[in-house]
Interface confidence: medium
């Protein structure tokens, strides 16, 4: 069960794995989520009743029962990891912490004009995990405007203390904002001869690379394949660093592969490993053994069991019961197998809990003005929202984002007095399919953003809470919300869909239309709409020459973009000047800017 709320003045008793320092309970929750074993945490906020040496401690905890006894304690804030949740998570943290000194190894100090410049410097420095910046009000003259870049073994501060007139923050590499080089190549027959900071077992170089990417100190790696001559080193993934940030020596060695951390790449790197490895046995601590039908079900079982990190599915005759094989659910201290054996009659793989690989990331069938007709199941998150007053008609589009939630535009509800007159139809391709007896979802509640006034001024976003839950099928399933860490991703495969007009004076289309539309920068968009303010909470899309666009009736529907093989709800059709006009792009609500609002509303008790 996903619990995102933080429990104030509450401490979880026992189950301690380790203690780190974080500037907030929110960040403690993120650290817990990325830790291989952490399920719960207790954070201590600054408080006169607490010993200052305990301020900002974040105690990561584990429990076989997935919960721990709660004890009342002032200044303690507790909560659960996001591993239990299905929404996409990100390590991206743009917060700036005022009057906090986050301590670490200060390896670089320089003058910066602002905290933002200091943060940019940290983001563009290969070793930097976080920074402290002394503002121009700082009492020490020599320290004023000084930007201290810091790193630690864990990527989190070694201590956090109160210090007036300084600010601290984290590198934004995990927000895909770094300008450092991103080297994606994996080099065969190569060993990087630099100091090892850690080593783990991995089934292939790609997994090794992803582990390196999410390890705070790893800058590059060397992986010894299963054919490596030294048996004891086979499948060993060496995580490496160097002072310069680059390998000092490359040695040609057969059956070894080397590569670089992708921490600086301008896209999100999955934390999880989805591939299944046939003929491989992953060793680790036994969590559970169950009989299931097929390796995919075994992986699903592991993903659902929150403490499971990896699994082996055995088809040995003695491990079979009817048509089911034995599914060994396992874990280890670092989330990686303790040994990897080949030539077995089994298949192994990892839990998908940190892919946040859920209904929204499931592969969709392969594959609007100037658009073309869609096929059934192509856009399974697209819904048609009907009003029954005065007569029944298509009102707006919308997107399934959860089993009880539709995301749409606020401007759709102008003049809508009550949710009772609304009907949500999902899994629809043609409007003509909707008859008197067609099943629909009633709307329990309309939640409009409280800052919404009109579409053109932004905040054009609304949630519909359905009266009943959606059972996911191939034709009706959710779309992923964009991750905050992907704010700077450049989406290149974006589509707008809807039953709206095909030209300005037209009628609602029978068949769901689709059009591929390129995103336009906000600067470019602002030039096209001089009379309006295009804010960062809006996103624009359209061809310079026009011809393809959303139009009346498409409002509230999705601007869907495919990234890393997953569809994301990047925009909500909001407004524009005419339809498909030359140099008048469509303006959409920039969903990534509202992820916190969405989560707050959909997860409120």
């Amino acid at each position: 069960e996903c619990v995102t709320q933080l429990l104030k003045d509450t401490c979880f008793e026992g189950g301690d794995i380790t203690t780190v320092f974080t500037p907030s309970a929110k960040y403690c929750q993120v650290v817990c989520t990325y830790h291989p074993r952490c399920l719960l945490f207790t954070f201590t906020a600054e408080s006169p009743s607490e010993d200052p040496t305990r301020w900002f401690t974040c105690v990561l905890k584990d429990s076989v029962t997935e919960t721990l006894p709660r004890v009342n304690r002032t200044a303690a804030i507790s909560g659960y990891s996001f591993k239990q949740c299905s929404h996409q998570i990100s390590a991206c943290n743009k917060d700036i912490y005022v009057d906090l000194d986050m301590k670490g190894i200060n390896y670089n100090s320089s003058v910066a004009k602002s905290a933002q410049e200091c943060q940019e410097r940290c983001t563009d420095d290969v070793h930097c995990h976080f920074f402290t910046y002394a503002t121009r009000q700082f009492p020490s003259l020599e320290h004023r405007n000084i930007c201290l870049l810091k790193h630690t073994q864990t990527g989190t501060p070694t201590r956090i203390t109160k210090l007036d007139k300084v600010v601290s923050g984290f590198s934004l590499k995990s927000c895909a904002l770094s300008n450092l080089a991103c080297i994606r190549d994996i080099f065969p027959n190569t060993v990087f001869a630099d100091s090892n900071i850690d080593s783990v077992m991995a089934p292939d170089a790609f997994v090794c690379g992803r582990i390196c990417t999410h390890h705070p100190g790893c800058l590059f790696f060397t992986f010894f394949s299963q054919e490596w001559p030294k048996e004891s080193q086979r499948n060993l993934c060496l995580l490496k660093t160097s002072e310069s940030g680059l390998p000092s020596t490359r040695i040609k060695k057969s059956k070894a592969l080397s590569g670089f951390s992708l921490q600086s790449c301008r896209h999100s790197i999955p934390v999880c490993h989805s591939k299944i490895y046939p003929g491989v046995d992953f060793g680790g601590e036994e969590l559970n053994v169950t009989f299931v039908k097929g390796v995919n079900v075994c992986q699903e079982t592991c993903t659902k069991m929150i403490r499971c990190q990896f699994f082996t599915y055995s088809l040995l005759p003695e491990d079979c019961k009817e048509e089911k094989g034995k599914c060994f659910l396992r874990l280890s201290m670092d989330g990686s197998p303790t040994r990897i054996a080949y030539g077995t009659q089994g298949s192994s793989g990892y839990s998908l809990r940190l892919c946040m690989d859920n209904e929204c990331t499931t592969k969709i069938k392969p594959r609007i003005v100037g658009g073309t007709a869609s096929v059934r199941g192509e856009w399974p998150w697209q819904v048609t929202l009907h009003t029954t007053s005065p007569t029944q008609r298509h009102l707006c589009g919308g997107s399934i984002i959860g089993n009880q939630w539709i995301l749409t535009a606020a401007h759709c509800f102008y003049g809508v007095e009550s949710p009772k007159i609304l009907r949500v139809y999902s899994g629809i391709l043609n409007q003509s399919e909707i008859k008197e007896d067609t099943s629909f979802f009633g709307v329990q509640e309309i939640i409009i953003h409280d800052q919404y006034k009109m579409a053109e001024s932004g905040y054009d976003i609304a949630l519909l809470k359905l009266e009943t839950t959606v059972n996911y099928t191939d034709s009706q399933r959710p779309i992923c919300l964009p991750s905050k860490g992907d704010r700077n991703v450049i989406y290149t495969d974006c589509w707008v869909t809807g039953w709206g007009y095909r030209k300005l004076r037209d009628k609602i289309q029978n068949t769901l239309q689709k059009a591929k539309i390129p995103l336009v920068t906000n600067e470019e968009c602002q030039k096209r709409y001089r009379g309006h303010k295009i804010t960062h909470k809006m996103i624009c899309a359209g061809y310079r020459e026009g011809g393809k666009d959303a139009c009346k009736g498409d409002s509230g529907g999705p601007l869907s973009c495919k990234h890393n093989e997953v569809w994301h709800l990047v925009g909500i059709t909001s407004w524009g000047e005419g339809c498909a006009q030359r140099e008048r792009p469509g303006v959409y609500t920039n969903v990534v800017e509202y992820v916190d609002w969405i989560l707050e509303k959909t997860q409120a008790v």
Epitope: N106, S140, E142, L148, T161
Partner: antibody
């Protein structure tokens, strides 16, 4: 390695002037704040002046020397200077030039060997 | 200006002794305190920075502690080369940088 060598000290009469120099080597001189610190015979350390690296207008002085001493630097020659005017008997001291490093907090991490200034009639 | 007061002004100790020197600031200086060692006829040498961090190359028998207004420098086992004068210095509210008056450590 880092080296700071002071010169220009000597005996001078009250009211007269003297210019001290400090030659720096072994580090990127222009990137660092530089100080003058003095020590009267048998006494403790007294900070005199600082020249900040990042702002040419940022020169600061101890109250005891304000208006009489001027700190300056020539980054092209890796040199630090202290122009001392209207000297008084109480200015008699060993004058050290020191490099400042920000190791979490500002520190005087390298010092020259010092040059003695004696103000006497 | 922030005043720094060291105590004692001088002390006698023997090789192998554990020695503690204290430094008090007239107002809170967080951990913006450094310690220096000066031998006769020589320039001062940085020992400890930020109240408790050991400068590279300084023996581990030297340690510093404290925060706010009260600080200590400890030499765990006195060696012959440790007989010198020790100064504390604040760099929290500057200018001016201010030093303590010094503590002279001599052989008993």
């Amino acid at each position: 390695q880092v080296q700071l060598v002071e010169s220009g000290g000597g005996v001078v009469q009250p009211g007269r002037s003297l210019r001290l120099s400090c030659a720096a080597s072994g580090f990127t001189f222009s990137s660092y704040n530089m100080h003058w610190v003095r020590q009267a015979p048998g006494k403790g350390l007294e900070w005199v002046a600082i020249f900040l690296s990042y702002d040419g207008s940022n020169k600061y002085y101890a109250d005891s020397v304000k208006g009489r001493f001027t700190i300056s630097r020539d980054n092209s020659r890796d040199m630090l200077y202290l122009q001392m005017n209207s000297l008084r008997a109480e200015d008699t001291a060993v004058y050290y030039c020191a490099k400042s490093e920000i190791l979490v907090v500002p520190t005087l991490d390298y010092w020259g060997q010092g040059t003695l200034v004696t103000v006497s009639s | 200006d922030i005043q720094m007061t060291q105590s004692p002004s001088s002390l006698s100790a023997s090789v192998g002794d554990r020695v503690t020197i204290t430094c008090r600031a007239s107002q809170s200086i967080s951990s913006y305190l450094n310690w220096y060692q000066q031998k006769p006829g020589k320039a001062p040498k940085l020992l400890i920075y930020a109240a408790s961090s050991l400068q590279s190359g300084v023996p581990s028998r030297f340690s510093g502690s404290g925060s706010g207004t009260d600080f200590t420098l400890t030499i765990s086992s006195l060696q012959p080369e440790d007989f010198a004068t020790y100064y504390c210095q604040q760099s929290y509210s500057t200018p001016p940088i201010t030093f303590g008056q010094g503590t002279r450590l001599e052989i008993k």
